[in-house]
């Protein structure tokens, strides 16, 4: 029961996390204009991974996509890649974990197969979460670097008494959504891996078999001991647990391959 709960909870947490990663990736507020030096601006700038937006005094918001691919900073491309890899892995993980759920019966799927699928999806969620956290962190680092660089040469156009304040950007809502979502996906993945262990305890050195000590087949005779142990052909004997534990080199690894959009 605890295993089912852990698996189910892991699935739900991962589902929320991946939904969050998708939301963060699509959001326009990855970086927002820092209002510290210009709190009365009537023009508010904010940027996402795919487009930049400007909200004007009228309340009208205009967004323009980054229609170039080669002209974009390599770091932005890397963040895009990390987020997309995270989404793809997470989506595959969700698909796999649906079939792995103990509460869902699909044909005559054995528990060992479910355990393997649970572990696979768990690892995928962990990698997905790490991709999202890495992507958001790289972007945040880029923002911090640019923030202090623009602070260093804050007033760039000192033309007489007129000053041109360079627009500085700070953390947008999408970064926090991304960090939380990545963390949730990671936690969900760990829970799936824990559930997998519950589904299939590690195999010991000896084969796990059931011992049948049937009364009629054991004979006690004076002067000797004869026992029919039923050890013969074990084809009819069922294992108590279907072993789902796999050695580390058996676990499938999924390459982080990604075509840039």
């Amino acid at each position: 029961m605890a295993v089912t709960a852990c698996q189910g909870l892991g699935f739900v947490v991962s589902l929320i996390g991946i939904a969050g990663i998708i939301a963060a990736t699509c959001m326009d507020q990855w970086s927002t204009q820092d209002l510290y030096n210009n709190p009365v601006t009537a023009v508010f700038n904010y940027q996402g991974l795919w487009r930049s937006c400007v909200r004007e005094s009228s309340g009208f918001t205009e967004c323009r996509g980054y229609f170039t691919l080669l002209g974009l900073p390599a770091m932005l491309q890397a963040v895009r890649a990390l987020m997309i890899v995270g989404i793809v892995l997470g989506a595959i993980g969700l698909l796999v974990s649906i079939f792995a759920l103990k509460c869902i019966r699909i044909g005559s799927m054995e528990d060992s197969a479910k355990a393997n699928m649970t572990l696979t999806s768990g690892i995928m969620f962990i990698v997905s979460g790490l991709c999202a956290i890495a992507g958001v962190s790289v972007f945040a680092n880029m923002l911090v670097t640019n923030f202090w660089m623009s602070t260093a040469n804050m007033y760039t156009g000192m033309g007489g008494m007129v000053q041109t304040v360079q627009t500085r950007y700070t953390f947008g809502a999408a970064l926090f959504v991304g960090w939380v979502a990545g963390g949730l996906t990671l936690i969900g993945g760990v829970m799936m891996c824990i559930a997998c262990r519950g589904l299939a305890p590690e195999e010991t050195n000896y084969k796990a078999v059931s011992y049948h000590a049937s009364g009629h087949s054991v004979a006690y005779k004076p002067g000797g001991f004869k026992a029919s142990t039923g050890f013969g052909s074990n084809t009819k004997n069922k294992k108590i647990y279907d072993g789902g534990a796999r050695t580390e080199d058996e676990v499938q690894s999924y390459p982080s391959k990604h075509d840039y959009v």
Epitope: V40, T41, A42, V43, N45, S57, G59, T164, T167
Partner: antibody, heavy 115, light 113 residues
Framework: QVQLVQSGAEVKKPGASVKVSCKAS????????IHWVRQAPGQGLEWIGY????????NYNLKFKDRATMTSDTSISTAYMELSRLRSDDTAVYFC????????WGQGTLVTVSS | DIVMTQSPDSLAVSLGERATINCKSS????????????LIWYQQKPGQPPKLLIY???TRDSGVPDRFSGSGSGTDFTLTISSLQAEDVAVYYC?????????FGGGTKLEIK
């Protein structure tokens, strides 16, 4: 088409308050900010502030911060601007404006403050 | 606050001639986020509300005749009427649309010579 229809002219005594309304039609009322601008007789334009009907947020010119109150009623697509503690130099035509670059203006409401 | 200074205060131009009105702001109205200048030009005739001519320094509003054009960047802006018509007689205002409080120029009264 976009229209902003303002309430009629008002005559007030110094120290009193006036509430001017601006009824919008022809666009999604909550999508754009409603700005208020005034123009004293024979003078230039002066920005009072704006209200954002979508979220109720507002921004005031510090000159009017303690006397002006902007509200809106989204159910009837109407914005209001109330100016309290009126003085004789508040005599002006009060306009509401909206749209990109203030593309749409109300016809104006003349507020006369006289004892 | 950003101070908007218009020049000249009044201008008399012959019909069919070019009219030029200048506007200077005390701070830059250039937004680096989208590389646009947030300056607006209005035309106001007696007893009427102002009418939008140009926004973002150079973008003509729909329905505005193409004889009206806006130019400039940063702190210096110009409204040009390429060929003055009788119906262009009015007061013209520039407005800072970049920083609160939004501020207007003092106005330029355009007349026919």
């Amino acid at each position: 088409q976009v229209q902003l229809v303002q309430s009629g002219a008002e005559v007030k005594k110094p120290g009193a308050s006036v509430k001017v309304s601006c009824k919008a039609s022809g666009f999604t009322f909550t999508s754009y900010n409603i700005h208020w601008v005034r123009q004293a007789p024979g003078q230039g334009l002066e920005w009072i502030g704006y209200i954002s009907p979508g979220n109720g947020g507002s921004n005031y010119n510090l000159k009017f911060k303690d006397r002006a109150t902007m509200t809106s009623d989204t159910s009837i697509s109407t914005a209001y601007m109330e100016l309290s503690r009126l003085r004789s130099d508040d005599t002006a035509v009060y306009f509401c404006a909206t749209g990109r670059g203030f593309a749409y203006w109300g016809q104006g409401t003349l507020v006369t403050v006289s004892s | 606050d950003i101070v908007m200074t218009q020049s000249p205060d009044s201008l008399a131009v012959s019909l069919g001639e070019r009219a030029t009105i200048n506007c200077k702001s005390s701070q830059s109205l250039f937004n680096s986020g989208n590389q646009k200048n947030y300056l607006i030009w209005y035309q106001q005739k007696p007893g009427q509300p102002p009418k939008l001519l140009i926004y973002r320094a150079s973008t003509r509003d729909s329905g505005v005749p193409d004889r009206f054009s806006g130019s400039g960047s940063g702190t210096d802006f110009t409204l040009t009427i390429s060929s003055l018509q009788a119906e262009d007689v009015a007061v013209y205002y520039c407005q800072n649309d970049y920083s609160y409080p939004l501020t207007f120029g003092g106005g330029t009264k355009l007349e026919i010579k």
